[in-house]
Structure formats: structure tokens, C-alpha cells
Amino acid sequence: VPRWRQQWSGPGTTKRFPETVLARCVKYTEIHPEMRHVDCQSVWDAFKGAFISKHPCNITEEDYQPLMKLGTQTVPCNKILLWSRIKDLAHQFTQVQRDMFTLEDTLLGYLADDLTWCGEFNTSKINYQSCPDWRKDCSNNPVSVFWKTVSRRFAEAACDVVHVMLNGSRSKIFDKNSTFGSVEVHNLQPEKVQTLEAWVIHGGREDSRDLCQDPTIKELESIISKRNIQFSCKNIYRPDKFLQCVKNPEDSSCTSEI
């Protein structure tokens, strides 16, 4: 008789999750030779230990501490790019501008990007059928707690000028409920971070509005200023040209506003 299994509202663990995490870890050490001695089996064991045999609505940041310790990585603190609701462009940017880093350019972010996982209380099984949805089921689920933990640590590590890419096509360009708005903004350290510079990415080709004047951007500016961090904002009117100019800054067309 099959054992009764909790049905959650979200999709189940990504298929071949253990193999995917291990393979990504090995690939990361190949791409980033400064991490060439990382023991990926130890990393996987710590990852697994954070959620296996635990109730998937009862996960804490403490559960992920062993993994956080193993994944400790020195990223240049003045080269951090945060993003909200515009992941693909942020990643395209750091692929070109190799000295800048998003969270997903770090080992732990790279391991978990776009994956889902959860276990079951009192069994060593991974649940491939369903996992808790943040809204419909619970917020303290393995995936949400992981991203909250790594995002907090990433923001805490930042210094000097921190950049954030925001999606100007959304109704809330800055969303207080996003990971950026709820975690990263509040964990930037005022004694280390001088300025948060927002890059608002325009979607429409003919969109010439100054989205830095958007009420949600003004709200972000207010939050940041209250934290004794300076705020600046730039419109990126042409993201395609923006990327092209990052690739070829000498191009004559790159002196005008992008």
C-alpha cells in the first residue's frame, strides 16, 4: 500500500535533483578555477542535510548554515549586481562584464538557480510530486528559505557602489515583496555601502519616459536614504544596445545615452 504523501500546491523537486546539483558543482569548479578544490560531494551532503527528513514548511536559515559555511566564497564586494524580476538580462550582463557578479554567479546561487526541492518529515525521500508553494502553502519552505539565506549573505557582503537592475516594464518597478525588496535592501550594510545605483530597464522601444521618477523608485530611494546609503538611478532605454556597448565600449554609438 503506498504511503500517504502530503500534496502541496507547488511543483515537485526538479527531476534528477541530486545529480543536477553535483554536476553543477563540478562544472562551477571548472569554470571558476579559484574554487577548483571544492569537494562537491561534501557540498551536496550539506545541501541534502538542510531539507531531507524535515517538514518542508518548517525549514529555517539555521538548517542551511552547514551549506553556507561550505559555500563560503570571496566575491569582490564592490562588483555586486543585484536584480529584481529581470534575471536573464542581469545574467547576460555579467557574462559579458566578467568582473561583476550576480548571486547566481556564486557557487551556491549557481547550484540552485531555477531548481525546486523539498523532502518529507521523517523520511529520507525527496518529494518529486509536489513542494510547498510560498503563497498557498507556507513561506518557510526549502527553496524560499534557501534564497532568503543566500540573498541576505550576498547583500551583507556588498560594499562601495552596489548596482541593482530593475524591470521597468512591470507595474511595480520596485516591489517591496520581492527578494530584493524584502531581503537584500534591508541587509546592505551602511558602514560598507556608499551608494545603491538602480538601473531601470525599459521594455518598449519607444519608451522615453524617465522611469527613475516612478513612485516605486521614489519609495526605494526613501528606504535606502533612511538607511544612510546614497541612491542614484539610471534609465536603460535600450537594453539590447546597453549589452552591445558593454561588449564593445569603443563603438562610436556608445557615447550617447543608452
Epitope: 569548479t29 578555477p33 574554487m35 571544492v38 569537494d39 559555511k69 561550505l70 563560503t72 570571496t74
Partner: antibody
């Protein structure tokens, strides 16, 4: 045959400078991360620092940071250790050692030179 | 004071099995692969074990390495007089961003 051969050791006054060389042969030097490791008389191994294949990345032990500089000339298959502001405690045998890469895996310090002695 | 802790000495009689321990922390041994080096008297160190438990070609299978959590160990079975040497463990430290060695263990074959 894979070989590393250090040279440039000798006697130097405290506060003085010295440049050690490590000539590599028998392998693709351009791709190899290269280490300097030292051993004071009667003591254990102490890692000094490392440089990546194209010379753009270096890491140093705290004890030598700001005083020692690791560089390389890939056209000459040679690794260097420029030592300045030398102290008595820098007296040691200095070894160069290769980090190898095989099948996308790295192997730390799989080949060592015979060492060169520095006396301060 | 080394970041990795090894016993300063170990001994055994020919044919015996001896184990040398190496203890560290979560940012070095636990996170990264452990390597072991053998230094015979008056010679340069030689790689003995890489990636926790792998042996380079030419190293006898009497030498074996293992790792568990923040500790690693080197086992030598069927001890021979030519095994008399100093043994060092080593690994990268992700927080210090440096390579760290243990203080070394002098193995005496009685």
C-alpha cells in the same frame, strides 16, 4: 619529463631583496597554476602564494603579503618570486610546485622543484 | 600555529598499519579536497594522495586517504622502513583564501 628547477637563492641582508626563478619544462606551462612553498630549517611546509595560468590572479599568505610578488613569463616558461623587505624569518628553502589540471580536475602541487635556499 | 592540526609524530613497526590524522574546519577540510604529501629526509615533498583518497600513479596502494566532515586521515598499511618520512596534509581555505598545510607528522619505523 616534467621538471621544475628553482634558482636565485643566496645570502641577503635584512631589509634586502632577492628574486627567485623557477624554470618549467615538459608540460603546458601556460595553463598551470603555480605555487611557491617554503620550509624554514627544521620546520614544516608553509605556502607562500599562487598565480594562475595567465598571471592575472595571485593569492598570498598573510606573512608575505605586500612584501613578495609572484609573476610569470609564459614565453620563457618561467615563474618568479620577487622578495623585498626580507626578514630573518624568511630564511628557508623555497620550492615551486605545479597545480595540474587533468580531465577538468585540478590536482594541487603534483610536481615540485628541488628547492633553492634563501638565508637572511 | 597551523590551521590544520596533525600529531607531531607517529610510529610503528614494519608490517604494521599506522594512521595519521588531520583536523581542520568547515572552510577548509570540510569544504575542499584534502591532499597528502610525503617528504623523505633531505628531499622535496611529493604528492601522495589527492582529492581525499586518490593515489597518483606510482604510489603504492598501501597508502590510503579518507575524509569525514572536518577531519581527514592518511593510513599506511604494511609499514616499511622506506616510509620513514614527514607527512603533511593540505587544502585550500575558502575564508582565508590561502592554501593551508598541517604542521607535519614525523613517522618513525621502529
Amino acid at each position: 619529463e616534467v621538471q621544475l628547477l628553482e634558482s636565485g637563492g643566496g645570502f641577503v641582508q635584512p631589509g634586502g631583496s632577492l628574486r627567485l626563478s623557477c624554470a618549467a619544462s615538459g608540460f603546458n606551462f601556460n595553463n598551470a597554476w603555480m605555487n611557491w612553498v617554503r620550509q624554514a630549517p627544521g620546520k614544516g611546509l608553509e605556502w607562500v602564494g599562487i598565480i594562475n595560468g595567465d598571471g592575472t590572479n595571485t593569492y598570498y599568505a598573510d606573512s608575505v603579503k605586500g612584501r613578495f610578488t609572484i609573476s610569470r613569463d609564459n614565453s620563457k616558461n618561467t615563474l618568479y618570486l620577487q622578495m623585498s623587505s626580507l626578514r630573518a624569518e624568511d630564511t628557508a628553502i623555497y620550492y615551486c610546485a605545479r597545480d595540474n589540471k587533468l580531465n577538468d580536475y585540478y590536482y594541487a602541487m603534483d610536481v615540485w622543484g628541488q628547492g633553492t635556499t634563501v638565508t637572511v | 600555529q597551523s590551521v590544520l592540526t596533525q600529531p607531531s609524530s607517529a610510529s610503528g613497526t614494519p608490517g604494521q598499519r599506522v594512521t595519521i590524522s588531520c583536523s581542520g574546519g568547515s572552510s577548509n577540510i570540510h569544504a575542499n579536497y584534502v591532499y597528502w604529501y610525503q617528504q623523505l629526509p633531505g628531499t622535496a615533498p611529493k604528492l601522495l594522495i589527492y582529492r581525499n583518497s586518490q593515489r597518483p600513479s606510482g604510489v603504492p596502494d598501501r597508502f590510503s586517504g579518507s575524509k569525514s566532515g572536518t577531519s581527514a586521515s592518511l593510513a599506511i598499511s604494511g609499514l616499511q622502513s622506506e616510509d620513514e618520512a614527514d607527512y603533511y596534509c593540505g587544502t585550500w581555505d575558502n575564508i582565508l583564501n590561502v592554501w593551508v598545510f598541517g604542521g607535519g607528522t614525523k613517522l618513525t619505523v621502529l
